[in-house]
Interface confidence: low
């Protein structure tokens, strides 16, 4: 069998909401993957498991099942959304993400994704990790790959 290539493209959008009482930030982060089937037979994308880390803490997980079938020598772009919560010991980020005098509210998130494909009863897992910058201060739609190159503004201590 030839390879199945998984390429993490980046963050497609991030939608933010806040809980005032809990000093909590909710970020729904939609990511984009390109999965290429280099074989002369179809493969099934059985599931995608993803998690997001902020400051070495897992802030969100997602799992998609029975996603799609990719035909021979074909490529499919797949979007998946990870709901994340920044709270509790990270509630200090609340000020950073909402204060007007901070213009760029980018935070560094580590995106981890594992794609499980199957063909002829054989299962294969491919994992990727990538650091991305996400604006936690407003709803943002990114051009593909854009979130990788933004400068991150660390909050003043």
């Amino acid at each position: 069998p030839r390879s199945i290539d998984v390429k993490y493209i980046g963050v497609k959008s991030a939608y933010v909401s806040y809980d005032v009482q809990k000093r909590t930030i909710y970020l729904n982060i939609t990511n984009t993957l390109n999965i290429t089937n280099n074989n002369y037979y179809s493969v099934e994308v059985e599931n995608i498991t993803a998690q997001v880390q902020f400051s070495k803490t897992v802030i969100g997980k997602a799992r998609l099942n029975n996603i799609t079938i990719i035909g021979p020598l074909d490529m499919k772009q797949i979007d998946y959304t990870v709901p994340t919560v920044i709270a509790e010991e990270m509630s200090y980020m609340y000020d950073f993400c909402t204060l007007i005098s901070i213009k760029v509210h980018n935070i560094v998130l580590m995106m981890q994704v594992t794609v499980t494909t199957t063909y002829f009863g054989h299962s294969e897992q491919i994992s990727q990790e990538r650091y991305q910058y996400v604006d936690c201060g407003r709803n943002t739609t990114y051009q593909l790959g854009q979130s990788e190159y933004l400068n991150v503004l660390q909050p003043q201590q």
Epitope: V20, Y94, F96, L99, I100, S101
Partner: antibody, heavy 118, light 112 residues
Framework: QVQLQQPGAELVKFGASVKLSCKAS????????MHWVKQRPGQGLEWIGN????????HYSQKFKDKATLTVDRSSNTAYIQLSSLTSEDSAVYYC???????????WGQGTTVTVSS | DIVMTQASPSVSVTPGESVSISCRSS???????????LYWFLQRPGRSPRLLIY???NLASGVPDRFSGSGSGTAFTLRISRVEAEDVGVYYC?????????FGSGTKLEMK
């Protein structure tokens, strides 16, 4: 220690312009907003506007949009306010003050007294 | 624009007693993040303003704990307990929730 140094006084002619300076020291100049505040004799404080020295983004009070221009010189860690078409209404003490990305308006200059004479 | 109102131009107090200075805003200064973006400053005669309170109720560095701030989204109070002679001056509130930032007109504290 943090210091914002302003000249004590400026005497300027009616209709002229003046450029006031505020030299910052003791901290990273580009990490803090610089604000300018006006105080007429015996009156209260008025917020003129602020500038981010890192990229020169400015915000102005509508009242001062056509009167004041805020700039910075990063090489000398100095913020400036230029006041144009001066009248007696512009005779006042002008303070600079810094604030962090959070919100502490913690250091103020001593103020420059501008006197407009005819 | 947000308008800040300090209704009392001056208050008079006997040294050692307590005094409250009030301030109102034309709209709520409570941010979505739960903080209320109001400052209190003291300007002593012939001096630059000095930060006393930030985010409505937080004591600034080096300020005696005789000073305290409280309030709701639109009504704010600066309380000074055990007033001392050095507390005389003009007290200003200021909002920095949104641009343009704005000051109250000031309340002068005088000693009886």
């Amino acid at each position: 220690q943090v210091q914002l140094q302003q000249p004590g006084a400026e005497l300027v002619k009616f209709g002229a312009s003046v450029k006031l300076s505020c030299k910052a020291s003791g901290y990273t100049f580009t990490s803090f907003w610089m604000h300018w505040v006006k105080q007429r004799p015996g009156q209260g404080l008025e917020w003129i506007g602020n500038i981010d020295p890192s990229d020169s983004e400015t915000h102005y009070s509508q009242k001062f949009k056509d009167k004041a221009t805020l700039t910075v010189d990063r090489s000398s860690n100095t913020a400036y306010i230029q006041l144009s078409s001066l009248t007696s209404e512009d005779s006042a003490v002008y303070y600079c003050a810094r604030s962090s990305n959070w919100d502490n308006f913690d250091y103020w200059g001593q103020g420059t007294t501008v006197t407009v004479s005819s | 624009d947000i308008v800040m109102t300090q209704a009392s131009p001056s208050v008079s107090v006997t040294p050692g007693e307590s005094v409250s200075i009030s301030c109102r805003s034309s709209q709520s200064l409570l941010h979505v993040n739960g903080n209320t973006y109001l400052y209190w400053f003291l300007q002593r005669p012939g001096r630059s303003p000095r930060l006393l309170i930030y985010r409505m109720s937080n004591l600034a560095s080096g300020v005696p704990d005789r000073f305290s701030g409280s309030g709701s989204g639109t009504a704010f109070t600066l309380r000074i307990s055990r007033v001392e002679a050095e507390d005389v001056g003009v007290y200003y509130c200021m909002q920095h929730l949104q641009y343009p930032f704005s000051f109250g007109s000031g309340t002068k504290l005088e000693m009886k």
